[in-house]
């Protein structure tokens, strides 16, 4: 599996999408896990509803949500209030029995919030008709890792 990079801004939300063959993975619950080290296990963060038919319902674990469009074949993970410690390698998984097939490997990168270093005078505020939520855009920039790029720092 190639690794896809998703970049988000600290303090904001990041949406990660994992496309899959909806027939190949029909009836299977999905999960989002965090890779512990280059060859370590993938620790489950959140999984879709226990009843596959209700996979479209958003499930949360802390600041991470998961929802599955089982007809369209897209698993969506939302990382709310992104923090530097959220950066790392993750996997979208398809579950069957106690087995898990990898749908996509994801490298989450957290960018510093550019607003953190500005004077209050430079801050942009929403107008009367705009809510603060409207201005709180979800950033989701993705790319595939280039050949030779390593998602983990090399270990000695």
């Amino acid at each position: 599996h190639n690794t896809t990079v998703f970049q988000g801004v600290a303090g904001q939300s990041l949406q990660v999408s994992c496309p899959y063959d909806s027939m190949k993975h029909w009836g299977r619950r999905k999960a989002w896990c965090r890779q512990l080290g280059e060859k370590g296990p993938c620790q489950r963060v959140v999984s879709t509803h226990n009843l596959w038919l209700l996979s479209f319902l958003r499930r949360w674990n802390g600041s991470t949500a998961i929802t599955d469009d089982t007809l369209g074949g897209t698993l969506t993970i939302t990382l709310r209030n992104l923090q530097p410690h959220d950066a790392g390698l993750y996997q979208c998984q398809s579950l069957h029995g106690s087995e898990a097939d990898t749908l996509r490997k994801v490298l989450v990168e957290v960018l510093a919030d550019p607003l953190d270093h500005r004077d209050a005078g430079d801050l942009w505020f929403p107008g009367e008709s705009e809510s603060f939520e409207d201005a709180h855009v979800e950033h989701s920039i993705s790319r595939s890792l280039l050949e030779g790029e390593i998602p983990f720092p090399p270990t000695s």
């Epitope: 063959d21 027939m23 190949k24 029909w26 009836g27 299977r28 619950r29 009843l51 596959w52 038919l53 579950l95 069957h96 029995g97 106690s98 087995e99």
Partner: antibody, heavy 123, light 107 residues
Amino acid sequence: EVQLVQSGAEVKKPGESLKISCKGSGYSFTSYWIAWVRQMPGKGLEWMGIIYPGDSDTRYSPSFQGQVTISADKSISTAYLQWSSLKASDTAMYFCARQRTFYYDSSDYFDYWGQGTLVTVSS
Amino acid sequence: DIQMTQSPSSVSASVGDRVTITCRASQGISSWLAWYQQKPGKAPKLLIYAASTLQNGVPSRFSGSGSGTDFTLTISSLQPEDFATYFCQQADSFPRTFGQGTKLEIK
């Protein structure tokens, strides 16, 4: 009506190659995994491996990895099991089976089976 | 690999009898277990999946129970067509594995 129809019985000599087939009908062949299961004379069932004809994703049992090749041709709704060099110990009945995922528990079981292909390897 | 052990290996019974076959997994498999019936010269037929769910078209005299490592298949009142060999199969992990089979014979 869902059907899996397997090719006929084969008698081969050790060292010969062989490819047996399993043709699916009555359902979307590319949307279900197909497994191969061996049953040696008077013995139990052994899972050999599985293929998803939609993209030819294949998994093998460690016991059969490197011993057989599982493939599929989705254009003719057919899965195959092949040997490059048969041994006498390959003598058995071989079944193909459709694997269905039951959403109740997100796991998969074999809901339709072919009639079996008897392979006899003898010098 | 997960080992599946069935007992007894064979059982003799009469029409109308209640028969129980057990299957034990070498490690916990939750409820990821199926039961199949096979008659001589025929392909196996799915009876029960997810340990206790009856496959469509299977008579209600067949029932399954258990979770973890211990499972049972019960036929409440044997019919002549039930004399066959029964296999359990785990669907927990690869490679999928079957029990060695239980042959149900007419007494």
